[in-house]
Each structure stands twice: as structure tokens, then as C-alpha cells.
């Protein structure tokens, strides 16, 4: 199946790579603007220069283009714990990340929140913390894994998700007939 092309893609495909079709005259192919610049005026005729201008502060274009405006630089989301890894330049958007010993949890494709990596107290590190994944811990005997933290089996009650992990210690725990809340 041939993918559906938008009008702009159809127009661009008529011209060789690095050029685009003049919006008012489809017999003219204009050279695209370099990254870091945007289209101010289309080329007046074949073989003539496209009028490209550099992006202003706070905006960028990251690839060759024929955009009428540069794109606004992203801002790192402080309320999500994000920090700026590198500033926006005319040809590259801001790069945001997390602090050391933190990992990213994505709420949507483009929005992430920073969380502290688990330290695996009362356990050992099975897999180290990574950019998009918390540390994976293995707990010592007498402890069970709860949201990636090792918790004492004394906090485990019958009918909870920890019972299998805490056997046979569970037999010694008080209040084993509770409803499952702690």
C-alpha cells in the first residue's frame, strides 16, 4: 500500500532532495533552508537563492526545512523534577533529563517525571538504575519486594500479595486474619 501523502509531501516529492516546490509556481524548485534557519521568502526563480533567515533566540529548526517560522524551544518541566541537560540553540531543541540517581517515568510519549532510584536497602542490586528504569532489587531473607523497596516480612499480613514471598515467616506474624489493609 502506498502511504497517504499530505499536500506538502506531494509537492516536495516533485523536486530533488534538498529542494521544495515553489508554492505559487510549481515549475520552480527552491533550495530548502539549512537547520538553524527558516524560510523568509521563496526563491524568485530557478537557480536563484531562497531567502533564509537565522532563528531568533528562543527558537530553532533541527533539520533542513521550508518553515515560515522557527519552532519554540522546549522548557524543562521543573514540577516533574526535570533539569536542563543542554540549552536550546538555533539548530537544536533544549534537552531535558533527570538528576543523577534518578530515572524517567513517562506519563505520555513526550512527558516524563523524575523519580529517585531505589537503593535496595535490606537487599542487593540485581539490575542497576537506568535512564528509563528503576533499580531492580533482590531482597534478603525476611524481606519482601514492595514497589521496588525491600520491606520487613513483619509488615506482611495474610491475604496480601506478600504472603508467598514471606513464607514461612508469615506463620509468626500477628493479626493474620485481617481484611488486607495495614
Amino acid at each position: 500500500l502506498v502511504p497517504h501523502l499530505g499536500d506538502r509531501e506531494k509537492r516536495d516529492s516533485v523536486c530533488p532532495q534538498g529542494k521544495y516546490i515553489h508554492p505559487q509556481n510549481n515549475s520552480i524548485c527552491c533550495t530548502k533552508c539549512h537547520k538553524g534557519t527558516y524560510l523568509y521568502n521563496d526563491c524568485p526563480g530557478p537557480g536563484q537563492d531562497t531567502d533564509c533567515r537565522e532563528c531568533e533566540s528562543g527558537s530553532f529548526t533541527a533539520s533542513e526545512n521550508h518553515l515560515r517560522h522557527c519552532l519554540s524551544c522546549s522548557k524543562c518541566r521543573k514540577e516533574m523534577g526535570q533539569v536542563e541537560i543542554s540549552s536550546c540553540t538555533v539548530d537544536r531543541d533544549t534537552v531535558c533529563g533527570c538528576r543523577k540517581n534518578q530515572y524517567r517515568h513517562y506519563w505520555s510519549e513526550n512527558l516524563f517525571q523524575c523519580f529517585n532510584c531505589s537503593l535496595c536497602l535490606n537487599g542487593t542490586v540485581h539490575l542497576s538504575c537506568q535512564e528509563k528504569q528503576n533499580t531492580v532489587c533482590t531482597c534478603h531473607a525476611g524481606f519482601f519486594l514492595r514497589e521496588n523497596e525491600c520491606v520487613s516480612c513483619s509488615n506482611c499480613k495474610k491475604s496480601l500479595e506478600c504472603t508467598k514471598l514471606c513464607l514461612p515467616q508469615i506463620e509468626n506474624v500477628k493479626g493474620t486474619e485481617d481484611s488486607g489493609t495495614t
Epitope: Y106, E109, R146, N148
Partner: nanobody, 120 residues
Framework: EVQLLESGGGLVQPGGSLRLSCAVS????????MGWVRQAPGKGLEWVSA????????YYADSVKGRFTISRDNSKNTLYLQMNSLRAEDAAVYYC?????????????RGQGTLVTVSS
């Protein structure tokens, strides 16, 4: 077995309010981040809001900030979503879900959902 049972959906006029509830059983409720996910007709799932086990940390999608409020009652194993100033674009099936932190977006355990219709 983990069970999440949503209620409170219905038909509301634009600008109106609804309060969704989610009764949770089969897991130790206060240990986990929980939240609300929605799916509008013909669209994918999206996280609307989430709250940490203690209730001390929250997340809201930009589209609902200032209009929706998430809360939880750990003594009742219940999660809530207060939705004010509802808009046509808020119409969707709303699911209660357990948050699985790391990577994502992922949707963990989910309930059957409750339908929210916003129409005049």
C-alpha cells in the same frame, strides 16, 4: 485477584461536574501509585491523573490541570477523581489503574471503566 471497580460516570452538560470513584481490592492499596486513564472514541489511552500511595505527590495531564482533582482514602481503599468545568473533549471511558513506575507510558492493572459523556 486484583479488582478495580469504577463508578460515577454519566451524562453531564459542558461546564458541569462529576466525581468518579474506584473501589480497589486484592492489593495493599496504600502501597501503590494509582491513577485515572481515559480513552476517547477512536483514540488511544492517556493518563489523566495519578497520586502516590501517601497522597503526597500527584500528576495531572496539562489538559485537565486546574479542573480535575485526584484524591484517595486509604482507609476505604478508594480512589477519586473530581472533575469540574467539563468540556466536550473530556468525554471518554475513564479507567482506574495501578501505576507501574519506570519507562512507560504503561497502564498496569485497569478496571472495566466508567463512561463520561459531555453534551448539551
Amino acid at each position: 485477584e486484583v479488582q478495580l471497580l469504577e463508578s460515577g460516570g454519566g451524562l453531564v452538560q459542558p461546564g458541569g461536574s462529576l466525581r468518579l470513584s474506584c473501589a480497589v481490592s486484592g492489593l495493599t492499596f496504600e502501597w501503590y501509585w494509582m491513577g485515572w486513564v481515559r480513552q476517547a472514541p477512536g483514540k488511544g489511552l492517556e493518563w489523566v491523573s495519578a497520586i502516590s500511595g501517601s497522597g503526597g505527590s500527584t500528576y495531572y495531564a496539562d489538559s485537565v490541570k486546574g479542573r480535575f482533582t485526584i484524591s484517595r482514602d486509604n482507609s476505604k481503599n478508594t480512589l477519586y477523581l473530581q472533575m469540574n468545568s467539563l468540556r466536550a473533549e473530556d468525554a471518554a471511558v475513564y479507567y482506574c489503574a495501578k501505576v507501574k513506575l519506570g519507562g512507560g507510558p504503561n497502564f498496569g492493572y485497569r478496571g472495566q471503566g466508567t463512561l463520561v459523556t459531555v453534551s448539551s
